[in-house]
């Protein structure tokens, strides 16, 4: 339910802003307002404290994995949630902080030589000769490169703008972190009023283009706060 | 240039079965997320299913869950549909589009007729 | 269930500013602020015309362009042209349906 998510770790633990890895401030998004939880058929604003949605592990922050917030909860519905600390109960190694992995259906620490040889094997073995769903750990390890080898194009699946091909950035889209155009003049924008805001939001527009700054449109001074429209402005 | 081809449409009995194909090229299919839409005679669009780059998560509408499977081959650069125990309400144009930003690019789509 | 709202048609005469509007709930575009639109000729697949409310992918004439006030969304083409005269659908979301699509607005160019 929404008050167990609320009352969840996932909380203390938000996600990244979108765009730069955990501990990267510089994020090269711009969230669009309203901070939106995806439950049941509606969304619900809940003091601007939201679950991240996620479809897959690696659209977390490092320190967090995909799941469902309820036991066999709906699969249309999953947040990052924190990770697990060393002894608690895993299913995959995605679930475990980093240091660790899971061993057993627990979190243990990992002695890294022993370690990296398991990671190594692992996605060997899973890019053979076809292209198999690397699970967890393994799977985050090998996106970077494998995945993206050549820059990823508009609306290819990213982890971080680096990603992406020039003019390009790396923001959440619903459903998984994408590669979209940098913003052009006049293109709307979004200011962040408070900081650390942009990395809870469904859909991400990007940071406006060189020499353009995210300013209010002149003639919207008028309007309420909250409704106000920003636009990409020349300096 | 980004190309997406359906096959595998026809006409088929209620309660028949048939599978879907989209054959995928001009861009790197395993980058993206792809989805099916279909459209009845006359009617609007209906979103039906998508998929994950991996193909490790799906969703589906609630008229198709259960009865519809995506799935996908990314050694052949391939999106599948499975569709069992179909319905006449099921009859449509069915595409296939890659989840770009949005639905970025459309096949030209195959049509599934449901009747006796 | 979300639903969206469209006229079910639209007509002008070419080079004419025409605008299609598409009314949801603040659940959906209200809520969301993001919405798309397609076209789609009669026999031919869709294609993306806008995407975040108001940005047109590369390739499409700039003749077209997007809005949002409140809870409507609206897709306006101006300097109307034969080859405009098509099916119209706004596209927004829902949390587990993904996609949800408007029922279509036919646009006839006259003359």
């Known amino acids: 339910t929404l008050n167990s998510v609320l009352n969840s770790n996932a909380i203390k633990n938000l996600p990244p802003p979108l765009g730069g890895a955990a501990g990267h401030p510089g994020s090269a998004v711009s969230a669009a307002p309203g901070i939106l939880y995806p439950g049941g058929n509606k969304y619900q604003t809940i003091d601007n404290y939201q679950p991240y949605p996620c479809a897959e592990d690696e659209e977390c922050g490092t320190d967090e994995y995909c799941a469902s917030p309820t036991r066999g909860g709906d699969a249309g519905v999953q947040i990052c949630l924190a990770c697990r600390k060393r002894r608690k109960r895993c299913m995959r190694h995605a679930m475990c902080c980093p240091g660790n992995y899971c061993k057993n259906g627990i979190c243990v620490s990992s002695d890294q030589n022993n370690f990296r040889g398991e990671i190594e094997e692992t996605i060997t073995e899973s890019f053979g000769n076809d292209h198999s769903t690397l699970d967890g750990y393994s799977r985050r390890t090998t996106l970077s490169s494998k995945m993206y080898h050549s820059k990823g194009q508009e609306g290819s699946v990213c982890l971080r703008s680096s990603d992406c091909a020039t003019g390009l950035c790396c923001a959440r889209h619903f459903w998984s972190k994408i590669c979209k155009p940098v913003l052009k003049e006049g293109q709307v924008c979004t200011k962040h009023r408070r900081k650390g805001s942009h990395g809870l939001e469904i859909f991400q527009r990007c940071y406006c283009g060189e020499g353009l700054s995210c300013r209010i449109q002149k003639d919207h001074h008028q309007a309420s706060n909250s409704s106000r429209l920003h636009t990409c402005q020349r300096h | 240039q980004v190309q997406l081809v359906e096959s595998g449409g026809g006409l088929v009995q209620p309660g028949g079965s048939l599978r879907l194909s989209c054959a995928a090229s001009?861009?790197?299919?395993?980058?993206?997320?792809m989805s099916w839409v279909r459209q009845a005679p006359g009617k609007g669009l209906e979103w039906v299913s998508g998929i994950s780059y991996s193909g490790s998560n799906t969703h589906y509408a609630d008229s198709v869950k259960g009865r519809f499977t995506i799935s996908r081959d990314n050694s052949k650069n391939t999106l599948y549909l499975q569709m069992n125990s179909l319905r006449a309400e099921d009859t449509a144009v069915y595409y296939c589009?890659?989840?770009?930003?949005?639905?970025?690019?459309w096949g030209q789509g195959t049509l599934v007729t449901v009747s006796s | 269930d979300i639903a969206l709202t469209q006229p079910a048609s639209v007509s002008g005469s070419p080079g004419q500013s025409i605008t299609i509007s598409c009314t949801g709930t603040?659940?959906?575009?209200?809520?969301?602020?993001?919405v798309s639109w397609y076209q789609q000729h009669p026999g031919k697949a869709p294609k993306l015309m806008i995407h975040?409310?108001?940005n047109r992918p590369s390739g499409v004439s700039n003749r077209f362009s997007g809005s949002k006030s409140g809870n409507t969304a609206s897709l306006t083409i101006s300097g109307l042209q034969a080859e405009d005269e098509a099916d119209y659908y706004c596209?927004?979301?829902?949390?587990?349906?993904?996609?949800?699509f408007g029922g279509g607005t036919k646009l006839t160019v006259l003359g």
């Open positions: 001009g861009f790197t299919f395993s980058s993206y997320w």
């Open positions: 589009a890659r989840m770009g930003i949005d639905l970025d690019y």
């Open positions: 975040d409310g108001s």
């Open positions: 603040s659940s959906d575009v209200g809520g969301f602020n993001y």
């Open positions: 596209q927004t979301w829902d949390s587990l349906s993904f996609f949800v």
